[in-house]
């Protein structure tokens, strides 16, 4: 992520980029893309790019259109370096199991979990 | 899932029986497990999930413990349910950016955004 | 910008406990363990513990466990470190820090609070 | 619990002087070691981390090496500022353990 604009500024600004452009994006009434079932967005990363991919391909560029899907691909640049720090690190297994804790816990609480 | 527990309950279960079986768990000293250096949790499932596999293979089984191993299993295979569910539905473009506008609403207020 | 700020000095008899706080701002407090370390004067530091403020999940060194308590008030993202029976050589500068991942190094430090132990 | 012993425990030297400190841990700790610098009367500062990694804003005459149980901290060429007290930490194992520092002094 260039230092420019820190991710957090950067994902607002695609949400408003996002709001501004969703007419001319809609525009193709024949295009279908992968939209997951439910909401534990994480999990779905690899799919949600993969949509935005699709889409960009289908989508006349210039303007603030072309900076919409730059800012994309850098959110998506970003989620990537996070996923890398999923697995960088060998630690003991006490630390192991705490972050375990703290991922069941996670799930326990704040995930969408259906029945 | 097995119909007999939700799996909002088995979590539960799990935690308890991460907490019983903790000792046992870190008896093995010289063992590295990689653990996320963030806590956007869900990115990485895949290095949680094969760490539990390092663990249980270098854990004596018996018990309440070989319930807990089990139990991370069913986890494991509700999750990965919920990610095939990721790419199972082609939607129109406007219910796409619906979701991907979620995706980036739930990144700008929940995500851990290191600057 | 990410800051600690403690507590003020303390006086405190021997027998007593005291309750240092560490108030963090501008992150997200739930997403960073906080630890606690102690300097004696003239001496090194010594690690007491850390605490989770996501889960309340605390780790003691064994020297420290069963008399400091480490606990944390989300919503006013304060972290707080009580230690009980004191005695003459827990005086000391208490500091807080932040650990930047997960069991990570300390990327920010509180400014620390003299805790003095006298009769 | 892992021991880490620093060494020296005092050195003098001068400005534009090369300044190494050594850390040995009791056992492995991977690269799981920071180095701290504390000046009279503040709070520790954290320089380096993962043995070698200089944290953003800290200068890079501070360098840091090793892993296992060996680990070194280097300043390159010694400023006025510079003159401390410094810290080892290993962050691999519970509980956390600290050198006994080294106080770098002005010869």
């Known amino acids: 992520i260039p230092t420019e604009i820190p991710t957090s500024a950067l994902v607002k600004e695609t949400l408003a980029l996002l709001s501004t452009h969703r007419t001319l994006l809609i525009a193709n009434e024949t295009l279908r893309i992968p939209v997951p079932v439910h909401k534990n967005h994480q999990l779905c990363t690899e799919e949600i790019f993969q949509g935005i991919g699709t889409l960009e391909s289908q989508t006349v560029q210039g303007g603030t259109v072309e900076r919409l899907f730059k800012n994309l691909s850098l959110i998506k640049k970003y989620i990537d370096g996070q996923k890398k720090k999923c697995g960088e690190e060998r630690r003991r297994v006490n630390q192991f199991l705490a972050y375990l804790q703290e991922f069941l816990g996670v799930m326990n609480t704040e995930w969408i979990i259906e029945s | 899932i097995p119909t007999e527990i939700p799996t909002s309950a088995l979590v539960k279960e799990t935690l308890a029986l991460l907490s019983t079986h903790r000792t046992l768990l870190i008896a093995n000293e010289t063992l590295r497990i990689p653990v996320p250096v963030h806590k956007n949790h869900q990115l990485c499932t895949e290095e949680i999930f094969q760490g539990i596999g390092t663990l249980e293979s270098q854990t004596v089984q018996g018990g309440t413990v070989e319930r807990l191993f089990k139990n991370l299993s069913l986890i494991k295979k509700y999750i990965d349910g919920q990610k095939k569910k990721c790419g199972e539905e082609r939607r129109r473009v406007n219910q796409f950016l619906a979701y991907l506008q979620e995706f980036l609403g739930v990144m700008n207020t929940e995500w851990i955004i290191e600057s | 910008q990410v800051q600690l700020v403690q507590s003020g000095a303390e006086v405190k008899k021997p027998g007593a406990s005291v309750k240092v706080s560490c108030k963090a701002s501008g992150y997200t407090f739930t997403n960073h363990h906080i630890n606690w370390v102690r300097q004696a004067p003239g001496q090194g530091l010594e690690w007491i513990g850390y605490?989770?403020?996501?889960?309340?999940?605390?780790r003691y060194n064994q020297k420290f466990k069963g008399r400091a308590t480490l606990t944390v008030d989300k919503s006013t993202s304060t972290a707080y470190m009580e230690l009980s029976s004191l005695r003459s050589e827990d005086t000391a500068v208490y500091y807080c820090?932040?650990?930047?991942?997960?069991?990570?190094?300390?990327?920010?430090w509180g400014q620390g609070t003299l805790v003095t132990v006298s009769s | 619990d892992i021991q880490m012993t620093q060494s020296p425990s005092s050195l003098s030297a001068s400005v534009g002087d090369r300044v190494t400190i050594t850390c040995k841990a009791s056992?492995?700790?991977?690269?799981?070691l920071s180095w701290i610098q504390q000046k009279p009367g503040k709070a520790p500062k954290t320089l380096i981390h993962?043995?070698?990694r200089l944290i953003d804003g800290v200068p890079s005459r501070f360098s840091g090496s090793g892993s296992g149980q060996d680990f070194t901290l280097t300043i390159s060429s010694l400023q006025p500022e510079d003159f401390a007290t410094y810290y080892c930490l290993q962050y691999d194992d519970f509980p956390y353990t600290f050198g006994q520092g080294t106080k770098v002094e002005i010869k």
């Open positions: 056992q492995d700790i991977n690269s799981y």
């Open positions: 605490i989770n403020p996501y889960n309340d999940y605390s």
């Open positions: 820090a932040r650990d930047y991942g997960n069991f990570w190094y300390f990327d920010v």
């Open positions: 993962r043995a070698d």
